[in-house]
């Protein structure tokens, strides 16, 4: 894991339990799904459903699996080589600038605007001006028309792991 690691990502203290599989490092690195021993001689497997590693590494521990928050659905579980993939529930979305929570999609566009994009797990409905066709930033909507939208079906899963 060459990326910056924050301490919140880390798994609880691990000592190599007898059931954890061991293998030898290759050029000082252990394969995905493993971490290295203190002396650098062994690769110790991560614990399925508890922690993981995605890259060849020389870390002393595997990374803690993400737990999906309430308001999220689990698209795929945590394995020893891949973190949990969580996605916002239908009718909610997660913005890049506020990734910590799922927000409710707007039910309709402000007056004078028309909906051109559905609510997806990673974006709010998209509105454009009827005349100019320019996008609406989607901040605080003005008085809403009765144009409403049903939550859109995601085109593809949005992985927010790592």
């Amino acid at each position: 894991e060459s990326a910056l690691i924050t301490q919140q990502d880390l798994a609880p203290q691990q000592r190599a339990a007898p059931q954890q599989k061991r293998s030898s490092p290759s050029e000082g690195l252990c394969p995905p799904g493993h971490h290295i021993s203190e002396d650098g001689r062994d690769c110790i497997s991560c614990k399925y459903g508890q922690d993981y590693s995605t890259h060849w590494n020389d870390l002393l521990f595997c990374l803690r699996c993400t737990r999906c928050d309430s308001g999220e659905v689990e698209l795929s579980p945590c394995t020893t080589t891949r973190n949990t993939v969580c996605q916002c529930e239908e009718g909610t979305f997660r913005e890049e600038d506020s990734p910590e929570m799922c927000r409710k999609c707007r039910t309709g566009c402000p007056r004078g605007m028309v909906k051109v994009g559905d609510c997806t797990p990673w974006s709010d409905i998209e509105c454009v001006h009827k005349e100019s066709g320019t996008k609406h930033s989607g901040e605080v909507p003005a008085v809403e028309e009765t144009v409403t939208s049903s939550p859109g079906t995601p085109a593809s899963p949005c992985s927010l792991s790592g």
């Epitope: 798994a11 203290q13 000592r15 021993s37 203190e38 521990f61």
Partner: nanobody
């Protein structure tokens, strides 16, 4: 925020002893190593010794084996370097550092560093 505070440096006669301490705070990693490095004037920083928190695995540079002893106090989150039979070539600024990598004897494997303490023999 991880902080490392070294102490115990000073001036000593050849053949004498010193004990360096490094107190760590802000560490919540499940396991980590604490190492000592040294840097003499005009020279590169070099590895001296390291100890790991969970299993207590230790490493020493060949130049200090048999003279220096590294130990740890888990309750105090402190690592010690007992230096004996000191020589003129041991004169350097001694740095404490923390790693989350195994078998870490290279500077680039260490993520956090203290300010250093001067040892003059």
């Amino acid at each position: 925020e991880v902080q490392l505070l070294e102490s115990g440096g000073g001036e000593v006669q050849p053949g004498g002893s010193l004990r360096l301490s490094c107190a760590a705070s802000g560490l919540t990693f499940p396991n980590y190593g604490m190492g000592w490095f040294r840097q003499a004037p005009g020279k590169e920083r070099e590895f001296v010794s390291a100890i790991y928190w969970s299993g207590g695995t230790v490493f020493y540079a060949e130049s200090v084996k048999g003279r220096f002893t590294i130990s740890r106090d888990n309750a105090k989150n402190t690592v010690y370097l007992q230096m004996s039979s000191l020589r003129a070539e041991d004169t350097a600024v001694y740095y404490c550092a923390v790693t989350i990598r195994g078998a870490a004897t290279q500077t680039w494997k260490y993520d956090y560093w203290g300010q250093g303490t001067l040892v003059t023999v």
